[in-house]
């Protein structure tokens, strides 16, 4: 299968870097734009702290930890109201990701 320039292989994702509009007020929550080309039944998500195509049912049910979003060796927990997840590093530092 031949891909045109800029085309993504099915089932893969890439981080798209965009120039920020400096006229917009600064927002403090880190955001990242991702472009994915997923198979049917899949949707853009996060696996091992990288963008990935994941089962759409995970997103629908908000069972975020099922997509294995944290690095190997880290613990995953759902936030209250399933608004996102936390990754707990072996040393105890906790990283939070909220889904908007």
């Amino acid at each position: 299968q031949f891909l045109k320039e800029g085309q993504l292989a099915a089932g893969t994702c890439e981080i798209v870097t965009l120039d920020r509009d400096s006229s917009q007020p600064r927002r403090t929550i880190a955001r990242q734009t991702v472009k994915c080309s997923c198979f049917p039944g899949q949707i853009a998500g996060t696996t091992r702290a990288r963008p990935a195509c994941v089962d759409a049912r995970i997103i629908k049910t908000k069972q975020w930890c099922d997509m294995l979003p944290c690095l190997e060796g880290e613990g995953c927990d759902l936030l209250i109201n399933r608004s996102g997840w936390t990754c707990t590093q072996p040393g105890g530092r906790i990283k939070t990701t909220t889904v908007s």
Partner: antibody, heavy 114, light 113 residues
């Protein structure tokens, strides 16, 4: 809008115990950790410690024993400092610590002088 | 001893020029990429520019670029503007179980000519 504001900084004498308070708004301490950082006049940034959203604190090796970080309410994190010396004179900042420290409070000045 | 060494300690640049600031850690940062860069102006708290070594924080100009992995990191400021005059700090995250969770570099003062 996520915000942090430090309070409690003042002029104290050596040996004093002082508690600073970081009050947050626009985000939940049950979801995010907070770090305390200080900056002596004309000097660089120095990390003091961090408290995770599960109340678990971690400290810089030099700060262990004399500094205590605790969550005192759903919107406040305290930094308790004991046996203060002139070397502790600095602006003390709190910051949400997640993917980088962001945002930061404006800081509160602690002056230790006899 | 956990240490972040920033070089140079001060640098001058003309408007429109390019500046490179280096940060070397005494041990690898967590996940080899958990390093952030901050800009601080007098009388103000630091402002997050870059996190995860190369990810631009929201609202930050794309003139700021972070790179590196493990123990060696670089902040590059291109098309330098007068407003970029400030002190820049790197901050590394480390496993809290083996060392201090965080450490800052000594800072680099940028003067605009």
């Amino acid at each position: 809008q996520e915000q942090l504001v430090e309070s409690g900084g003042r002029l104290v004498t050596p040996g004093t115990t002082l508690t600073l308070t970081c009050t947050v708004s626009g985000f939940s301490l049950s979801s995010y950790g907070v770090s305390w950082v200080r900056q002596a006049p004309g000097k660089g940034l120095e990390w003091i410690g961090y408290i995770a959203n599960n109340y678990n604190p971690h400290y810089a090796s030099w700060a262990k024993g004399r500094f205590t970080i605790s969550k005192t309410s759903s919107t406040t994190v305290d930094l308790k400092m004991t046996s203060l010396t002139t070397e502790d004179t600095a602006t003390y900042f709190c910051a949400r610590d997640n993917y980088g420290m962001d945002p930061w409070g404006p800081g509160t000045l602690v002056t230790v002088s006899s | 001893e956990l240490d972040l060494t920033q070089t140079p300690s001060s640098v001058s640049a003309a408007v429109g020029g390019t500046v490179t600031i280096n940060c070397q850690a005494s041990q690898s940062v967590y996940n080899n990429k958990n390093l952030a860069w901050y800009q601080q102006k007098p009388g103000q708290p630091p402002k997050l520019l870059i996190y995860a070594a190369s990810t631009l924080a929201s609202g930050v100009s794309s003139r700021f670029k972070g790179s590196g992995s493990g123990t060696q990191f670089t902040l590059t400021i291109s098309d330098v503007q007068c407003d970029d005059a400030a002190t820049y700090y790197c901050q590394g995250e480390f496993s809290c179980s083996s060392a201090d969770c965080n450490a800052f570099g000594g800072g680099t003062e940028l003067e605009i000519l």
